[in-house]
């Protein structure tokens, strides 16, 4: 069976990944546009997130506006919102399973069941990681594609926001944590009976000598 240290490390990384997904979801910085006028006074930055967009003036003043409806959100960000929310829920399930299957918890008595629960938790974290990496990479792909597309006017070109980097980090942590938990092999069952039973049987047999 994998060492407790490896298991704790896997859970810790996955939990960090889960928290990072929440941050990625909440930050309004999926797509960033920096408009620089001929003088610094006219410069402003527009941040677009899954829930709102914010305009930051060069003075430091920031105004955020929550999207009026789901239709106000571009299609790629609509899909990203759905996948990220599902990822958070799936990762939460992974956290729950890893607590149940943890070596240092007593939710399950059977070591084999604990190990299997841990493997399932690992798979769940891997799924959560994939659910984050897909929308984040897709959004980044669209941004890069539009940046080099001559049919996209200057004012419609975007840059990658901090949320995308947080998302990649989150997926990396979830995949790494999930991978470590999947290394948690169930105990080998080579012996047909336990040592306790074997000792008891030999003691009983000696009475008949």
């Amino acid at each position: 069976m994998a060492s407790m240290g490896l298991q704790v490390m896997g859970i810790a990384l996955a939990v960090l990944g889960w928290l990072a997904v929440m941050l990625c979801c909440a930050l309004p910085m999926w797509r960033v546009t920096a408009f620089i006028g001929s003088n610094i006074v006219t410069s402003q930055t527009i941040w677009e997130g899954l829930w709102m967009n914010c305009v930051v003036q060069s003075t430091g003043q920031m105004q955020c506006k929550v999207y009026d409806s789901l239709l106000a959100l571009p299609q790629d960000l609509q899909a990203a919102r759905a996948l990220v929310i599902i990822s958070i829920i799936v990762a939460a399930l992974g956290v729950l399973l890893s607590v149940v299957g943890g070596k240092c918890t007593n939710c399950l008595e059977d070591e084999s069941a604990k190990a299997k629960t841990m493997i399932v938790a690992g798979v769940v974290f891997l799924l959560a990681g994939l659910m984050v990496i897909v929308p984040v990479s897709w959004t980044a792909h669209n941004i890069i594609q539009d940046f080099y597309n001559p049919l996209v006017a200057s004012g419609q070109k975007r840059e990658m926001g901090a949320s995308l980097y947080v998302g990649w980090a989150a997926s990396g942590l979830l995949l790494l944590g999930g991978g470590l938990l999947c290394c948690n092999c169930p105990p080998r069952t080579d012996k047909p009976y336990s040592a306790k039973y074997s000792a008891a049987r030999s003691a009983a047999a000696s009475n008949y000598v």
């Epitope: 001929s38 996209v152 006017a153 004012g155 419609q156």
Partner: antibody
Framework: EVQLQQSGPELVKPGASVKISCKTS????????RHWVKQSRGKSLEWIGT????????RYNQKFKGKATLTVDKSSSTAYMELRSLTSEDSAVYYC?????????????WGQGTSITVSS | DIQMTQSSSSFSVSLGDRVTITCKAS??????LAWYQQKPGNAPRLLIS???SLEAGVPSGFSGSGSGKDYTLSITSLQTEDVATYYC?????????FGGGTKLELK
């Protein structure tokens, strides 16, 4: 020298369609996007749409969606615009233009224009 | 769509005059502005792009200035060949839009 040579004037009946061409020379055809602009008599200029000669990708002004269709033929370095269901409102001079390399929605070279008259 | 407004549709001018044509955008266009000159029966000709950059072959008497929403085309000393209609165009966002034009007419 960069040149955009457009097809000649057209007199068409209402409800008909017309396809005008714009042959380019003097530069690599696929390097710059191609725009089409409408100018009604005595009026200002209106952007119809644009096409990327590299891959045929198009963008249209909402006003001209369903009215204009832009295509290119890379082999002959020619861009085409088809206008359908013509009405008197479509009588105008139509220009094909080349997008500026670094600012593609600016237009550095213009064809001589093709006059379309819609009349029964 | 961004609206481009050229306040004067026509201007009576004399040769040698300094002429200033203004163009106002409905929102900030971050210097993505072009000026065109059109003479009767001809296609427009690009004079200035990026609000201030003079195109090759354009006389140095032409200049562009402005930022944000307000832009100006200036002709230092009007010549006969400068009598034409001038259009501004924003290319900050799609659809690109043109001003209504300013026609220069000799007094």
């Amino acid at each position: 020298e960069v040149q955009l040579q457009q097809s000649g004037p057209e007199l068409v009946k209402p409800g008909a369609s017309v396809k005008i061409s714009c042959k380019t020379s003097g530069y690599t055809f696929t390097e710059n996007i191609r725009h089409w602009v409408k100018q009604s008599r005595g009026k200002s200029l209106e952007w119809i749409g644009t096409i990327n000669p590299n891959n045929g990708e198009t963008r249209y002004n909402q006003k001209f969606k369903g009215k204009a269709t832009l295509t290119v033929d890379k082999s002959s370095s020619t861009a085409y615009m088809e206008l359908r269901s013509l009405t008197s409102e479509d009588s105008a001079v139509y220009y094909c233009t080349r997008g500026i390399t670094k600012s593609p929605y600016g237009m550095d070279y213009w064809g001589q224009g093709t006059s379309i008259t819609v009349s029964s | 769509d961004i609206q481009m407004t050229q306040s004067s549709s026509s201007f009576s001018v004399s040769l040698g005059d300094r002429v200033t044509i203004t163009c106002k955008a409905s929102e900030d266009i971050y210097n993505r502005l072009a000026w065109y000159q059109q003479k009767p029966g001809n296609a427009p000709r690009l004079l200035i792009s990026g609000a201030t950059s003079l195109e090759a072959g354009v006389p140095s008497g032409f200049s562009g200035s402005g930022s944000g929403k307000d832009y100006t085309l200036s002709i230092t000393s009007l010549q006969t060949e400068d009598v034409a209609t001038y259009y501004c165009q924003q290319y900050w966002s799609t659809p690109p839009t043109f001003g209504g034009g300013t026609k220069l007419e000799l007094k």
